[in-house]
């Protein structure tokens, strides 16, 4: 499940260029936009995927209340700077020398500034809340069946270990998936919750990043789960630093 040798493609990232020019004629794949080599046995980092996307042609309350420090990605797409490992650089700037600090999922966590802005470290997003609203169905889904299918989906499709799926909440028609992964919990080889959430988000939008694999067909006991709205909240290990002006 590395780069497929026979037709030299990257199963986990369609936004790549692959050729048999690796060691011993092995298939090697590079991300569009950055040209960085990617490991096709796992998810590609969100930073490299965003960069590739920007280079491509344009075409009883059980639900969790996001904390006051939760971030939503309101800025949308931008062409990010990635480090040699494919992670977001802590400071991002645009072509007009406007700069800001981002967290590990690339979401802005400070006010925008100029080139003098300092971002001392890349702050880790350790808690992601994926808030979904599903289309009307004949009846509510069985909560435990829904929970099981979503945990299996994150394990089998995104290769995210079940221990990082903290909870699945359901209050028809709202589903919330909580992903938690502290720096200390993440071992080498573990998929990052930010990357898994991004692949899931793209799947939900019908924009699968997987090569040759069918789009997401999520069913609970045979009943299709069709999502009509998605909101993702990001919580960082260190709260974001925005001025009061932004909060009013």
């Amino acid at each position: 499940h590395t780069a497929a040798q026979d037709n030299c493609t990257c199963p986990t990232n369609k936004m790549t260029v692959c050729s048999p020019d690796g060691p011993g004629g092995r298939c090697q794949c590079r991300a569009l936009g950055s040209g960085m080599a990617v490991d096709c046995s796992t998810l590609t980092s969100k930073c490299l995927l965003l960069k590739a996307r920007m280079s491509a042609p344009k075409n009883a309350r059980t639900l969790v209340r996001p904390s006051e420090h939760a971030l939503v990605d309101n800025d949308g797409l931008y062409d990010p700077d990635c480090d040699p490992e494919g992670r977001f650089k802590a400071r991002q700037c645009n072509q007009t020398s406007v700069c800001w600090c981002v967290n590990s999922v690339g979401v802005r966590r400070t006010d925008k500034g100029d080139l003098s802005l300092r971002c001392d470290e890349l702050v880790r997003t350790h808690h992601i809340l994926i808030d979904l609203r599903h289309r009307p169905t004949a009846g509510a889904f069985n909560h435990s069946d829904l929970d099981a299918e979503l945990r299996r989906l994150f394990r089998e499709r995104y290769r995210l270990h079940p221990k990082f799926v903290a909870a699945v909440h359901y209050e028809q028609p709202t589903i919330q998936i909580e992903l938690r992964q502290n720096t200390s919990q993440k071992a080498a080889g573990d998929v990052d919750i930010g990357d898994a959430a991004y692949y899931f988000e793209r799947d939900i939008k019908g924009e699968s990043l997987f090569q040759g694999r069918g789009g997401l067909d999520l069913r609970v006991r045979g009943e299709p789960l069709q999502v009509e709205r998605t909101l993702i909240y990001y919580l960082d290990e260190i709260p974001p630093k925005f001025s009061m002006k932004r909060l009013t």
Epitope: H1, E156, K163
Partner: antibody, heavy 118, light 109 residues
Framework: QSLEESGGDLVQPGASLTLTCKAS????????MLWVRQAPGKGLEWIGC???????TYFASWATGRFAISKTSSTTVTLQMTSLTAADTATYFC?????????????WGPGTLVTVSS | YDMTQTPASVSAAVGGTVTIKCQAS??????LAWYQQKPGQPPKLLIY???DLASGVPSRFKGSGSGTEYTLTISALECDDAATYYC????????????FGGGTEVVVK
């Protein structure tokens, strides 16, 4: 690190039986635990699986409804079987995945024999 | 995701080579394992990710394949290799009857 099954017995058709898998030397929470059975002289047959973190369970299509898996303590997982028939006569193994996100079984118990006969 | 394993039995001399094939009904993205089982013992993991050797497994065991077609080759056969070998898809446990192939008995003459 080891696994050991217990609870295998000779039971009558229609009876229920609970098998226990005891884990030693590792933290169950980092793994999925699977049950596999093998009828005498036959191949391996997957029964079901539990993701210990979260407690969600999954079963082979033929096992849904008649089998249940649960974590009963920090070191034990059980397989509950109901409405047993002669076709359920087999050695039952519990196995652990390798801690990755695939289902590679790198640790097995020695198995426990269940015989269903009148 | 049915796993079809062939042949059901194979015989070869000490020092020889045997090849066992496993076909998945759908692409399993090289998430395939091979196990060795001897009578009265639980299975032992030999190969994972289609071609990676598990710890302590001799390099005489070689796994290959991708997509839906996979092969286990045992070369320089030894008497101790006499066992039943099973393939297993390790990709999904959703809506399936079995994750294992039917098994291949290897007889060493």
């Amino acid at each position: 690190q080891s696994l050991e099954e217990s609870g295998g017995d000779l039971v009558q058709p229609g009876a229920s039986l609970t098998l226990t898998c005891k884990a030693s030397g590792f933290d169950l929470n980092n793994y999925a635990m699977l049950w596999v059975r093998q009828a005498p002289g036959k191949g391996l047959e997957w029964i079901g699986c539990i993701y210990i973190s979260g407690g969600t369970t999954y079963f082979a299509s033929w096992a849904t409804g008649r089998f249940a898996i649960s974590k009963t303590s920090s070191t034990t997982v059980t397989l509950q079987m109901t409405s047993l028939t002669a076709a359920d006569t087999a050695t039952y193994f519990c196995a652990r995945d390798d801690g990755s996100t695939s289902y590679y079984l790198n640790l097995w118990g020695p198995g426990t024999l269940v015989t269903v006969s009148s | 995701y049915d796993m079809t394993q062939t042949p059901a039995s194979v015989s070869a001399a000490v020092g020889g080579t045997v090849t066992i094939k496993c076909q998945a009904s759908e692409d399993i993205y090289s998430l395939l394992a091979w196990y060795q089982q001897k009578p009265g013992q639980p299975p032992k993991l030999l190969i994972y990710d289609a071609s990676d050797l598990a710890s302590g497994v001799p390099s005489r065991f070689k796994g290959s394949g991708s997509g839906t077609e996979y092969t286990l080759t045992i070369s320089a056969l030894e008497c101790d290799d006499a066992a039943t070998y099973y393939c297993q898809q390790a990709y999904t446990i959703g809506n399936i009857d079995n994750t294992f192939g039917g098994g291949t008995e290897v007889v060493v003459k």
